[in-house]
Amino acid sequence: AESCTSRPHITVVEGEPFYLKHCSCSLAHEIETTTKSWYKSSGSQEHVELNPRSSSRIALHDCVLEFWPVELNDTGSYFFQMKNYTQKWKLNVIRRNKHSCFTERQVTSKIVEVKKFFQITCENSYYQTLVNSTSLYKNCKKLLLENNKNPTIKKNAEFEDQGYYSCVHFLHHNGKLFNITKTFNITIVEDRSNIVPVLLGPKLNHVAVELGKNVRLNCSALLNEEDVIYWMFGEENGSDPNIHEEKEMRIMTPEGKWHASKVLRIENIGESNLNVLYNCTVASTGGTDTKSFILVRKADMADIPGHVFTR
């Protein structure tokens, strides 16, 4: 079974089939009789309930809200409600690039080292039963491959393999033809040696805060693709609903390494958030590097030398 849509922010391209699947699906089957509702809100409109009568493009199946296809005016916030369970998504529908076979903003980047194993597999598990055929394109030129259900490339990488690979799935629904495109930007690089990952900035940071306010603790590192950056705080990170780990931002450096940044957001700061360690760790198989943040009440700033503060 296809997993639920747990990401709260989603970007999709206009004109393609798309679906949202809520994350209490197994629960929904147990209580068939419970009222289940989908809502949309955008700009001026507050919570409008969705049903197949709202639009001929919308279909509802058990746990799923389907768009056939999704269009620009579908941008907005979507809610699923069942008893005391609510799930929310923010959907951003972007314009299709009419001059290309793919849309730049919806590209997945992959780096492959020369002579290492290189694979492209075209698959789409959710729409699998509806797919008539699938084509694989390189830089928008169709590749002639034997399997037209799940085209695949498996080989040792060469520099000429670099490019944009687009899997285009063609499917029929209610007598109409649709396609779904997934594009990979494949960069072929020389054999790269690993760096020792390092966190940027001081190892101990005292942050001046006010009770009831919010603070964002930013942790940045230089690392390899396979290294990981994470926050550690409290009892296995699960105890404080006011603490949120934001999504990691990664930018590739000219040397083929990564600059990563991960923010810990603490909302409505309370006494329990003061004078405790919030640790950010970058880990590789070669070891770890950790930096610590301590929240200190602004009134207590005078007790700590100025040079240890981050603003």
Partner: nanobody, 119 residues
Amino acid sequence: DVPLQESGGGSVQPGGSLRLSCAASKSIFSINAMRWHRQAPGKQRELVATFTSSGRINYADSVKGRFTISTDNAKNTIYLQMNSLNPEDTAVYRCNVGLWEDGLWYDYWGQGTQVTVSS
């Protein structure tokens, strides 16, 4: 979204072997980095093995030559074969993957599976 489920943990005698599995709920082809971590009580979490989509594999010195990370794309599963186990390998083992989605880097974690090595 890539929920992960580990299995294969358990108790084993020193010198024994175990194979941990980490099943992803969707294709692991789109995953850029696959990792196995471990954490023993009172110790810092340790990254023991990594596998990237570009074909690079790394191991922590403490497990080199004994542990092997591998994948099975058809089964959407990541494995950690652990041989010549010793008591210092006792820990909770968690798999973790990193991938690009909507231009953002996402890390997903499994719940973990307990490995105990004792005579």
